[in-house]
């Protein structure tokens, strides 16, 4: 018959920051030099030993002699509770076949965790206790007087737990979050009445969990050093030095060899000279609580990030064109290049490619004279491409070339006795043709009548206009401009010796608030094309003055600028241009964007007061400098009378009062006779213009009182 | 920002009552106990009592017992410390401290209160 | 109720040097409940040191606390010009009440 084998000399230990218990036995008469298969079941009580809280079996092989352990974790801190612990064991080898049956239990061992010393009332376990968010803890009080009443707070706010014994109470935290990097805070109050008996806390300190590193990479820029980088994603760090940062190493599995990164993001690995091609990193990050890692294969050549290009410079730039040459770093024999070039200017930006060995070089063409480019230039393996170097760059300015185009000119003419003045207007050259920078004007003046005689005025930019007084002739007017390179072509003017068209009438014209849609009759016989051009009514015309040219078989057209303003009046003349370039004026408008009401009213004058009427005038009234037409005015009457005169109707004033009110609809009419009065009556009157827009200002009624039948004025 | 304000100094004659307040900004307000500890012209620092934010519940020094009562208003995150039959030996700068039960010191301190008792 | 007793009552020391403040319990103290104060004229009390030897957010590494049972130390390794105030040993236990120590003084020799 067999002897039961059961465990003896049972021995426990504690990890209090681990919350671990670690047995260790031995087994009593087990044959000497025989190893068996066993099973161990372990009991587990808190408190008392007949609370079991945890059974479980523990298989293992075990030979004469041997010390076993086993350790076992508990979720409530040790300081908590007593925990009393006994094994017993169970033959399970095929040596020994049917029936097998348990040994006796090894007697309880008990554990006692005593942190709860000195003289204090009340203890919170477990101390600045490690954990990852989301993990379950389960913490306690031990209370020393069961009289106290025991609150505990997580954050403040109160938090309800179980009760194991009358002096211990035990708190299951679920899922805890992570709240700041120096811990989450729990505390304990004991308090008889509204007494506090104590306080006391501890700090839970819960580590965010830590990340696998994304956009793991490695690449090289000379096959001397590998650059790793990575986004680390979350710093795990804690407070008081409870958690560094997560560390970083390398692992290359090929040559087995490893590294511990100093930086949190990136890493640089020596590249040994033994014509190593293939690599096989893991990159490890790890702290307290766990490792996490990732994998990258890949052929150095496959990896190759070059150091930017340097010296980049321009050879031979004239106005259209320019050569530029860079060098790249020479990492290795036999080396191609593939480089990208990017040329920016003039608001446009074009893409070259080009393949190298050492040198780059590359024909910049069709370049914009008198421009500033910025051109810039980055370089990849053209064998395997892994990634654009950084860009080089540097501004170059091609050179000035001779205006490509004739300068846009106009002119008014007034006639004065025996001569004609001839105010000549030019805009400047857009940038596009000017081909550099303008530095003067020149204006070539031929009478057409005496073809030997001409006249060259010159005049410096930016000035853009210039006065001519001229005799009764006909004259050709050229205009030039010129930069350091040469002349553009010549625009062309004439001037007839015959007056302008005098018989041509103004027209009313409405505009919008898109500006002004104006329409013409096409000029009979040969046009090159139209002029319009336009001037504030009220101003000199040289303050501004604008054109616009319109081409041959157009007879309408839209002015909008955003110089157009509410209640000025704008004047526009229409020309036909022969194919002499003679202009003849066709149309004469005028009109507002927009018009306004009447700025001002007229000052009224009261002349010939009789008994039985008097007349109002206001000829120095101007309708000319209105915002806008004036249609008539409105000539308002207050008597005692109930009834309006005759031709005056009945009105509200904005007051609310009453009055009588006369529509005078000729803007040139500027007087009235107000007749039926009734001698010595008191009358008050006001007259406003108006226009599409309303009245003039309110202002104050003048009073008029009648002399009686014999009086005379 | 954490931050502890006290009310401005008091002047008062024997047997009067004193009131000081103490307004706390930057932290959660009941997570925290509140101490009391006043200073005598040249002298050390003495414990008066403490305060559980939270419950309101308090324990004094036993010298002050009777004499003293510590409130709380949660709603504004103020802490009081009323002290009664004033004698000349309370002229004391008075300070309020976060108690911080998790290292048991007292790490935010509110600027102190003057209170002077004279006759 | 516990007792501290601070030595020297006044340290006069020189920018530079090592200082070494003592404070002593009439009976012992559990070290997670004992903490250093500095306090300047005029200024409120501040905490350098808890749990007998960490220090506190934003003290300077050379302040230092050690200690257990009934005898703690305060040392500051290199003084620097700002360090000459009043130092105070203060104990909490869950059973109040609080106490602190008389203070010592460090002046500048």
């Known amino acids: 018959e067999r002897l039961p084998l059961t465990p003896v000399s049972l021995k426990v230990s504690t990890n209090s920051t681990r919350q671990s218990l670690h047995l260790q036995w031995t087994v009593h008469n087990l044959p000497y030099h025989q190893e068996l298969k066993m099973v161990f079941q372990i009991q587990i009580s808190r408190i008392e030993t007949s609370n079991v809280i945890w059974v479980g079996n523990y298989s293992t092989t075990v030979k004469w002699n041997q010390v076993l352990h086993w350790s076992w974790e508990s979720e409530l801190p040790l300081e908590c509770a007593t925990h009393f612990v006994r094994i017993k064991s169970l033959v399970d080898d095929a040596k020994f076949p049917e029936p097998n049956f348990w040994s006796n239990w090894s007697s309880w061992e008990e554990v006692s965790v005593q942190d709860s010393t000195g003289q204090d009332i009340l203890f919170v376990f477990p101390k600045d206790k490690l954990v990852e968010e989301g993990t379950n803890v389960t913490i306690c009080y031990v209370s020393r007087n069961i009289q106290n009443n025991v609150s505990c707070y997580l954050e403040g706010k109160q938090i309800h737990g179980e009760q194991l014994d009358p002096h211990v109470t035990a708190f299951n935290l679920n899922s805890v979050p992570f709240i700041r990097n120096k811990g989450t805070n729990i505390y304990c109050e004991a308090s008889q009445g509204n007494v506090s008996e104590g306080m006391k806390g501890i700090v839970l300190f819960v580590s965010k969990v830590l990340e696998e590193p994304k956009d793991f990479s490695c690449e090289t820029e000379d096959f001397k050093t590998l650059h790793c980088t990575w986004d680390p994603g979350t710093d795990t760090a804690l407070g008081w030095s409870k958690q560094p940062s997560q560390s970083y190493t390398l692992f290359e599995s090929f040559s087995g060899e490893k590294k511990l990164c100093t930086h949190k993001n990136w890493c640089n690995w020596q590249i040994t000279q033994d014509s190593q091609e293939t690599y096989n990193f893991t990159l490890i990050a790890e702290n307290y609580l766990r490792k996490r890692s990732v994998n990258i294969l890949f052929n150095l050549t496959h990896r190759v990030y070059l150091m930017n290009p340097f010296s980049v410079n321009f050879e031979n730039v004239n106005a259209t064109n320019a050569i530029m040459t860079w060098k790249v770093h020479s990492i290795r024999n036999n080396f191609t290049y593939l480089c990208q070039i990017e040329l920016h200017g003039e608001g446009k930006m074009m893409q070259y490619n080009v393949s190298i060995k050492v040198n780059g070089e590359y024909f910049l063409s069709e370049l914009e004279p008198a421009t500033e480019y910025m051109a810039r230039v980055r370089c990849a393996d053209a064998s395997h491409f892994w990634k654009w170097s950084e860009w080089s760059g540097q501004n170059f300015t091609t050179l000035e070339a001779a205006p490509s185009e004739a300068p846009d000119v106009w002119r008014i003419v007034s006639l004065e006795p025996g001569n004609h003045t001839v105010t000549l207007f030019w805009k400047p050259l857009s940038k596009l043709h000017a081909n550099g920078k303008i530095l003067f004007y020149n204006v070539v003046v031929e009478n057409l009548d005496k073809p030997s005689s001409s006249e060259l005025h010159s005049i410096p930019a930016p000035a853009n206009s210039t006065k001519l007084i001229l005799d009764r002739c006909s004259y050709q007017i050229c205009v030039i401009a010129n930069n350091s390179v040469g002349a553009s072509p010549a625009s062309v003017i004439v001037i007839s010796a015959d007056p302008e068209n005098k018989e041509v009438e103004e027209e009313r014209i409405a505009g919008t608030e898109g500006g002004f849609s104006l329409s013409w009759k096409p000029q009979p016989g040969d046009v090159i094309g139209y002029v319009v051009d336009w001037c504030d009514h009220t101003q000199d015309v040289l303050g501004d003055f604008q054109w616009k040219n319109v081409g041959p078989n157009t007879t309408s057209t839209v002015i909008s600028t955003d110089a157009f303003r509410p209640g000025v009046r704008y004047d526009f003349r229409i020309y036909g241009l022969s194919t002499k370039r003679i202009a003849c004026l066709l149309e004469k408008k005028t009109g507002y964007s927009q018009e306004l009401a009447p700025s001002d009213n007229p000052h009224v004058l009261v002349d010939t007061l009789t008994s039985h009427s008097f007349t109002l005038s206001w000829k120095d009234y101007s309708t000319e400098s209105q915002p806008g037409f004036i249609q008539g005015y409105h000539v308002y009457l207050k008597s005692k009378a109930r009834q309006c005169h005759p031709r005056f109707e009945k009105a509200v004033l904005s007051d609310g009062s009453e009055c009588c009110k006369y529509k005078i609809d000729n803007p040139e009419e500027k007087a009235l006779i107000v007749d039926n009065l009734k001698p010595e009556s008191f009358y008050e009157f006001f007259i406003t213009p108006f226009t599409s827009a309303g009245e003039g200002p309110s202002a104050t009624f003048t009073k008029v009182t009648t002399p009686d039948e014999h009086s005379s004025m | 920002q954490v931050h502890l304000v006290q009310s401005g100094a008091e002047v008062k004659k024997p047997g009067a009552s004193v009131k000081v307040s103490c307004k706390a900004s930057g932290y959660t307000f009941t997570s925290y106990g509140i101490s009391w500890v006043r200073q005598a012209p040249g002298q050390g620092l003495e414990w008066m009592g403490w305060l559980s934010t939270y419950s309101g519940n308090t324990n004094y020094a036993q010298k002050l017992q009777g004499r003293v009562t510590m409130t709380t208003d949660t709603s504004t995150s103020t802490a009081y410390m009323e002290l009664r039959s004033l004698r000349s030996d309370d002229t004391a700068v008075y300070y309020c401290?976060?108690?911080?039960?998790?290292?048991?010191?007292?790490?935010?301190w509110g600027q102190g209160t003057t209170v002077t008792v004279s006759s | 109720e516990i007792v501290l007793t601070q030595s020297p009552g006044t340290l006069s020391l020189s920018p530079g040097e090592r200082a070494t403040l003592s404070c002593r319990a009439s009976q012992s103290v559990s070290s997670s409940y004992l903490a250093w104060y500095q306090q300047k004229p005029g200024q409120a009390p501040r905490l350098l040191i808890f749990g007998a030897s960490s220090r506190a957010t934003g003290i300077p590494d050379r302040f230092s606390g050690s200690g257990s049972g009934t005898d703690f130390t305060l040392t500051i390794s290199r003084l620097e010009p700002e360090d000459f105030a009043v130092y105070y040993c203060q104990q909490y236990g869950s059973s109040p009440p609080i106490t602190f120590g008389q203070g010592t003084r460090l002046e500048i020799k």
């Open positions: 401290a976060r108690g911080n039960f998790y290292y048991y010191g007292m790490d935010v």
